[in-house]
Amino acid sequence: AVNGTSQFTCFYNSRANISCVWSQDGALQDTSCQVHAWPDRRRWNQTCELLPVSQASWACNLILGAPDSQKLTTVDIVTLRVLCREGVRWRVMAIQDFKPFENLRLMAPISLQVVHVETHRCNISWEISQASHYFERHLEFEARTLSPGHTWEEAPLLTLKQKQEWICLETLTPDTQYEFQVRVKPLQGEFTTWSPWSQPLAFRTKPAALGKDT
């Protein structure tokens, strides 16, 4: 690895996964690197192999236990290191004291389904995945609907400022194909960010009844 701009960013999914991305300009693609996690008050250590995701960045997931197990708390600090093999030894390339509940990114919401659809309205529900019970109801959501002829980037964001795992979309056009996505964010954490968007849910509004005003 060479000297260059380096960045080491990790997020905790609030249960049993820390996902990390390491980027370094000028680093060699075929260099063998890993992330090592060393908690300050736990008996376990964990390692994952960094795999290339682009020309100068690598990513890996530290799997700390069963997906729904609560492996870390708000008082934990985990020292995270990027180690790269240089000849016969491992060299530390980056290091940070990681506070899991200050760096949260939850899993994307799952199980999206149409609860009820009409000509102009659609009620959709979803579930959150692998989210800590510590949050209680302190979560918020963003949702977006893809209309025909538009892109996701153009879709207006709908904000749900509470833990509400459903939405009623209104003012839709009859007999029209739409797609819907949602993402979640805990209110806690200085560096907390939005989850990835959910898988899109496709749905179609009902056609208008013949001979009636719409």
Partner: nanobody, 126 residues
């Protein structure tokens, strides 16, 4: 490669003071944190103190807090360890170390450091 040369060690009575210096040369632009470690006879090398590139962050092992102060002068590429109220238990060879690792921790380990000095002997007599 980075070269490190320590100086300032010696024999001192308990309660006395010493100031260790560590001069860095070579690829000093690549240095991030610098630290001091020590190794007493028959014991493993242990972390003493570290300082960030800017000097804004420092960390000490519990046994030296309040007695030792680490500082750095980037213009001179030198790091210092001011040791006050020395105790016989502080007797050891003191090593300066530098790391190119990006970032900061309060839990430095020997393996985090790439470059090492030859060490300077500190002996505290009772």
């Amino acid at each position: 490669e980075v070269q490190l040369v320590e100086s300032g060690g010696g024999l001192v009575q308990a309660g006395g003071s010493l100031r260790l210096s560590c001069a860095a040369s070579g690829r000093t632009f690549s240095i991030n944190a610098m630290g001091w470690f020590r190794q007493a006879p028959g014991k493993e090398r242990e972390f003493v103190a570290a300082i960030s590139r800017s000097g804004g962050s420092t960390v000490y092992v519990d046994g030296v807090k309040g007695r030792f102060t680490i500082s750095r002068d980037n213009a001179k590429n030198t790091v210092y360890l001011q040791m006050n109220s020395l105790e016989p238990e502080d007797t050891a060879v003191y090593y300066c170390a530098a790391t190119m690792a990006v970032g900061w921790t309060t839990r430095w380990r020997t393996a985090d450091f790439d470059s090492w000095g030859q060490g300077t002997q500190v002996t505290v007599s009772s």
